[in-house]
């Protein structure tokens, strides 16, 4: 028969022959032959392979270095790498989460639109008219101006995006 030029899924072509790939969690020891199957070997502790493969070495589990603000979100297995995330108050600098930076704070005049997570930074938004923020914070949203009317008071000083309105008593001299 003609030697194959392409192989099925989970196979690879070697020496004009289709051999089975090793399953996740195992590495290649020897290619198949006309008479023998592919020989695979499980990865050991602290190692993994996460795909059907023909790798001759398993990969080492990632180390979540606390000195870089990292901690383990999920321990690795023979088929998965360790997943790192950041300590409270920090977030990953990249998708691979190799290091962490402190969550950004929203300056006065800006409020938190979305609180940071282990993998995403704080998202800030300017306080719209009728709202203010007078603090630098990674948690505080813009607060609505105080409603003087509901307290039977009047606005003595207008609010800004950084300050609340100042309420005062009604002028009693008016008819």
């Amino acid at each position: 028969p003609e030697p194959p030029t392409a192989c099925r899924e989970k196979q690879y072509l070697i020496n004009s022959q289709c051999c089975s790939l090793c399953q996740p969690g195992q590495k290649l020891v020897s290619d198949c032959t006309e008479f023998t199957e592919t020989e695979c070997l499980p990865c050991g502790e602290s190692e993994f392979l996460d795909t059907w493969n023909r790798e001759t070495h398993c990969h080492q589990h990632k180390y979540c270095d606390p000195n870089l603000g990292l901690r383990v979100q999920q321990k690795g297995t023979s088929e998965t790498d360790t997943i790192c995330t950041c300590e409270e108050g920090w977030h990953c600098t990249s998708e691979a989460c190799e290091s962490c930076v402190l969550h950004r704070s929203c300056s006065p005049g800006f409020g938190v639109k979305q609180i940071a997570t282990g993998v995403s930074d704080t998202i800030c938004e300017p306080c719209p008219v009728g709202f203010f923020s007078n603090v630098s914070s990674a948690f505080e949203k813009c607060h609505p101006w105080t409603s003087c009317e509901t307290k039977d008071l009047v606005v003595q000083q207008a609010g800004t995006n950084k300050t609340d309105v100042v309420c005062g008593p009604q002028d009693r001299l008016r008819a």
């Epitope: 590495k27 499980p42 050991g44 080492q60």
Partner: antibody, heavy 118, light 106 residues
């Protein structure tokens, strides 16, 4: 600073049970497997088993199966190894040690000496 | 259960000598670890994943091998290298150690 601090030396009678603790500091115990290793005086290292503190999953050497129990308390970052039906051959130093990551290379406790004598 | 056999069980060598310790497994394993132990002390991980030196291990140490046969080599023995060395496989339960090789001063 990373440390594995084991409980103190024990003297036990044959047939008794010993429970050794291994308190970790400087890292989260759930991030590692904890292995226990036995070393008799003047002899080599023997792997007894390991525990995954995160879910309590254990693997024991059949040589110790039935006599050894490994547990972990994640609230105190402490692992325990209990060995029952002690005999003179159990006189040894017992070590706790962690799995390794490239960057930590495994940590070891200082060892706990257990003497079994009538 | 995989047996790990180390040879020799002990050796006498002089400072500057090249020293080779072998570790043989009864079945193929993914990798081995080598530990160094000095009297009265806990072992230290010396070589991981067959050939990678742990932090602080001098470059005169090397590890090699695959499958069932592994080697630890010290290219030029130094006074601080006199110790007992153990190999361990962590591929199949129960994990097993070799019997150890004691490196002594000639």
């Amino acid at each position: 600073e990373v440390q594995l601090v084991q409980s103190g030396a024990e003297v036990k009678k044959p047939g008794a049970t010993v429970k050794i603790s291994c308190k970790v500091s400087g890292f989260n115990i759930k991030d590692y497997y904890i292995h226990w290793v036995k070393q008799r005086p003047g002899k080599g290292l023997e792997w007894m088993g390991r525990i995954d503190p995160e879910d309590g999953d254990t693997k024991y050497d059949p040589k110790f199966q039935g006599r050894v129990t490994m547990t972990a308390d994640t609230s105190t970052d402490t692992a325990y190894m209990e060995l029952s039906s002690l005999r003179s051959e159990d006189t040894a130093v017992y070590y706790c040690t962690t799995s390794y990551y490239v960057g930590t290379y495994g940590y070891w406790g200082q060892g706990t000496t257990v003497t079994v004598s009538s | 259960q995989i047996q790990m056999t180390q040879s020799p069980s002990s050796l006498s060598a002089s400072v500057g000598d090249r020293v080779t310790i072998t570790c043989s497994a009864t079945s193929s394993v993914s990798y081995i670890l080598w530990f160094q132990q000095k009297p009265g002390k806990a072992p230290k991980l010396w070589i991981y994943s067959t050939s990678n030196l742990a932090s602080g291990v001098p470059a005169r140490f090397s590890g090699s091998g695959s499958g069932t046969d592994f080697t630890l080599t010290i290219s030029s023995l130094q006074p601080e290298d006199f110790a007992t060395y153990y190999c361990q496989q962590r591929t199949f339960y129960p994990y097993t150690f070799g019997g150890g090789t004691k490196v002594e001063i000639k």
